[in-house]
């Protein structure tokens, strides 16, 4: 059986939309599937790599690599999206390409970044971990770390940094899929909202879905002990 909830929820474009949340009900009347997984049920994607989930994550990363920051022209906010999802008339799509990107580093002026921009994250304004010396952030936003400390400045002069961010990574469903969404939408969908991250590639949704002890390598499920727990 399925339990359907419908509600008006604030979505990425800043408007309220009617959203359906479909929950698979437990036939025996008890915890939901997500709760059972958290309690240690035999759920194979938490025990070993699942090809379907792995391909989903890779597909999400490929899309994210090509994303940019969509900044609303009315200064109502910004969100990481694909170009096709960013209004050409109502918003500005900030995406580095060809020669428009910043240099990889102050020591390497010739090599320009082509991957980015990212809403609320920039190697030029992140103090921790700083992109410098042997630790220059790669020209692939899906390999960027979470910035834990921004440079202390009210404004940077960068469109993608001075906007109000409207969406962050949200882990939805038992398949460990990730979407950049508003907090409201994420909570309605019973997802896990990552306030600290800017990109889906910075979070490991399956690790969150599985719970219990975190994976040794967040990319590799290793909870073999589930076989004995249940």
């Amino acid at each position: 059986a399925q339990h359907v909830t419908t509600q008006l929820v604030l979505r990425n474009k800043g408007v309220y939309e009617s959203v359906k949340y479909i929950q698979q009900e437990n036939f025996w009347i008890g915890p939901s599937s997500i709760d059972l997984i958290h309690l240690g049920a035999k759920f194979s994607p938490c025990i070993r790599k699942d090809q379907q989930i792995e391909q989903l994550v890779l597909r999400e990363r490929d899309l994210e690599r090509d994303s940019g920051c969509c900044v609303q022209n009315d200064h109502s906010g910004c969100i990481q999206t694909q170009r096709k999802d960013c209004s050409e008339t109502l918003a500005t799509f900030v995406k580095w390409q060809d020669d428009t990107g910043p240099p990889m580093d102050k020591s390497d002026l010739g090599q320009k970044r082509t991957s980015g921009a990212v809403c609320h994250q920039d190697p030029r304004t992140c103090e921790e971990p700083a992109s410098s010396g042997a630790h220059i952030w790669p020209d692939d936003i899906t390999k960027w770390p979470i910035c834990t400390e921004q440079a202390k400045s009210n404004r940077t002069g960068f469109l993608h940094m001075d906007c109000q961010i409207k969406g962050r990574p949200c882990c939805i469903s038992t398949k460990g899929s990730c979407e950049i969404t508003t907090r409201e939408y994420c909570e309605f969908m019973h997802g896990y909202f990552h306030e600290e991250a800017t990109l889906c590639s910075q979070v490991h949704c399956l690790d969150k879905v599985c719970g219990l002890l975190p994976f040794l390598n967040p990319e590799v499920p290793d909870q073999f002990y589930r076989l004995w727990l249940s």
């Epitope: 020669d99 428009t100 990107g101 910043p102 240099p103 102050k106 020591s107 002026l109 010739g110 320009k112 030029r124 304004t125 103090e127 700083a130 410098s132 440079a151 202390k152 404004r155 940077t156 002069g157 960068f158």
Partner: antibody, heavy 123, light 106 residues
Framework: QVTLRESGPALVKPTQTLTLTCTFS??????????VGWIRQPPGKALEWLAH???????YYNSALKSRLTISKDTSKNQVVLTITNMDPVDTATYYC???????????????WGQGTLVTVSS | AIQLTQSPSSLSASVGDRVTITCRAS?????MFWYQQKPGKAPKVLIY???NLASGVPSRFSGSGSGTDYTLTISSLQPEDFATYYC?????????FGQGTKLEIK
């Protein structure tokens, strides 16, 4: 308000070493992303970049003069010092220090300059 | 080193005129920066990243260009605009400036 002021000898003899100090206020060179550079201008001629130093102590020099230049900073005193060895009459110029900014820029630029100090090299 | 050649080296114009100064780089660069210098004074940044107006700079100043050719335009000359203008690149070390364009009153 950001200000920078250059100080040093007005006259130096050929072969001597010139030491210039840039004292600044209104910003800190320990702040992430900040830098201070030196630029000179011989009388009636164009500007020439000499060197600059960043908050993380990374230093960059004009390769044509690199062997003669040393730049350093004293964050606690809000000072940047440039030394030029083996001075020659062709080094006669007004020496400027300037703050490096990247506000809104994919690169950086010299956004606030000192008033400059004229150094004459003569025996 | 990337060489920047400005043209003209000097030019005479009248208040209200539209003036264009060009800067040609010896090799392709991504962005150009422009500075204004008045006699006995330090330079002042006008334009960064080719076309962005620095803080406090009047909107009659504009910049454009790409590759190796860049221009600074003053749409309607004002008495305070008579000065020397320099282009500068930050695309490769050593950082270089153009030789300057002196703008004089006709």
């Amino acid at each position: 308000q950001v200000t920078l002021r250059e100080s040093g000898p007005a006259l130096v003899k050929p072969t001597q070493t010139l030491t210039l100090t840039c004292t600044f206020s209104g910003f800190s060179l320990s702040t992430f992303g900040r830098g201070v550079g030196w630029i000179r201008q011989p009388p009636g001629k164009a500007l020439e970049w000499l060197a600059h130093i960043w908050w993380d102590d990374e230093k960059y020099y004009n390769s044509a003069l690199k062997s003669r230049l040393t730049i350093s900073k004293d964050t606690s005193k809000n000072q940047v010092v440039l030394t030029i060895t083996n001075m020659d009459p062709v080094d006669t110029a007004t020496y400027y220090c300037a703050r490096i900014q990247n506000y809104g820029s994919n690169y950086w630029y010299f956004d606030v300059w000192g008033q400059g100090t004229l150094v004459t090299v003569s025996s | 080193a990337i060489q920047l050649t400005q043209s003209p080296s000097s030019l005479s114009a009248s208040v209200g005129d539209r003036v264009t100064i060009t800067c040609r780089a010896s090799s392709r660069i991504s962005y150009m920066f422009w500075y204004q210098q008045k006699p006995g004074k330090a330079p002042k940044v006008l334009i960064y990243d080719t076309s962005n107006l620095a803080s406090g700079v009047p909107s009659r100043f504009s910049g454009s260009g790409s590759g190796t050719d860049y221009t600074l335009t003053i749409s309607s000359l004002q008495p305070e605009d008579f000065a020397t203008y320099y282009c500068q690149q930050w695309n490769a070390y050593p950082l270089t400036f153009g030789q300057g364009t002196k703008l004089e009153i006709k």
